[in-house]
Amino acid sequence: KEEKTTFRDCAEIFKSGLTTSGIYTLTFPNSTEEVKAYCDMDMGGGGWTVIQHREDGSVDFQRTWKEYKEGFGSPLGEYWLGNEFVSQLTSGHRYVLKIQLKDWEGSEAHSLYEHFYLSGEESNYRIHLTGLTGTAGKISSISQPGSDFSTKDSDNDKCICKCSQMLTGGWWFDACGPSNLNGQYYPQKQNTNKFNGIKWYYWKGSGYSLKATTMMIRPADF
């Protein structure tokens, strides 16, 4: 009986010789559980596992803890890969996180963190980031030290309010913090002075809601 080849991330797929960007099946570490992910095999050497993407507002990101845990949306369009998979993947290996951003004026920028991982569910998928470089701000728009993840039904922020309900979307809210890439999607010319938009403060400032975002990870030793 032939053993099925499994891949834990898009870097392994790339190294296996499959170098076309698209949807691939990944397998949870030490498990047979599978998840479908978009692999970007073109950006900066390829091998990137996309864990979040926004582009047109077609998917509702105001979701429950369970939905953010398991993932939602379509890897061909807007989606969230799933906190549980990302946590398991990044806890066993050193990963970098690249956040690619587009504004409504035709500019692009990125933030690259040289080490990224999520704690487990027992720690509310707390985000850990070090080593910021890139063009989307010299200061991290994800609050440091990392915050716990919050959703509309699981409030783990440091605010007297409930950030996820106020700003919409699940995110690593502080109180509430300089970013929220899972906020409400606003179209062009309606994307400024927004209290709950797609925000990356240290690139575009306050109240500016972005056109497109992609969060992607790759092993540091790729």
Epitope: K158, C159, C161, A175
Partner: nanobody, 129 residues
Framework: DVQLVESGGGLVQPGGSLRLSCAAS????????IGWFRQAPGKEREGVSA????????YYADSVKGRFTISSDNSKNTVYLQMNSLRPEDTAVYYC??????????????????????WGQGTLVTVSS
């Protein structure tokens, strides 16, 4: 749509006074805090004063304490900044900005700059003889 419009800026001599207005639309002041900020040429934007209309709480930067007074008229959905004893170093573009009043860290009284998501276009204040 949320909109903030500042007015009242102008040229004033040192020691003089001005009253800036910030007219808000698209939301009610009851649920928001309004901050006044200023930016001088070549300098970072800095907080000057802020008010939470619901509780009447106010904040002032040390550099303007005793000289500036912030107030609000909720019936007009407008916040005012009365500036007395003006100095040349007060010369700047003055902006008002809004933040949902509840967006406060446990134990804190006021908001970091990045929490203010709605901004006006600014009004220029020049203090010169």
């Amino acid at each position: 749509d949320v909109q903030l419009v500042e007015s009242g800026g102008g040229l004033v001599q040192p020691g003089g006074s001005l009253r800036l207005s910030c007219a808000a639309s698209g939301f009610t002041l009851d649920d928001y805090a309004i901050g006044w900020f200023r930016q001088a040429p070549g300098k970072e934007r800095e907080g000057v004063s802020a008010i939470r209309s619901s509780g009447g709480s106010t904040y002032y930067a040390d550099s303007v304490k005793g000289r500036f007074t912030i107030s609000s008229d909720n019936s007009k959905n407008t916040v005012y900044l009365q500036m007395n004893s003006l100095r040349p170093e007060d010369t700047a573009v003055y902006y008002c900005a809004a933040v949902p009043a509840g967006r406060l860290r446990f134990g804190e009284q006021w908001y970091p700059l990045y929490e203010y998501d709605a901004w006006g276009q600014g009004t220029l204040v020049t203090v010169s003889s």
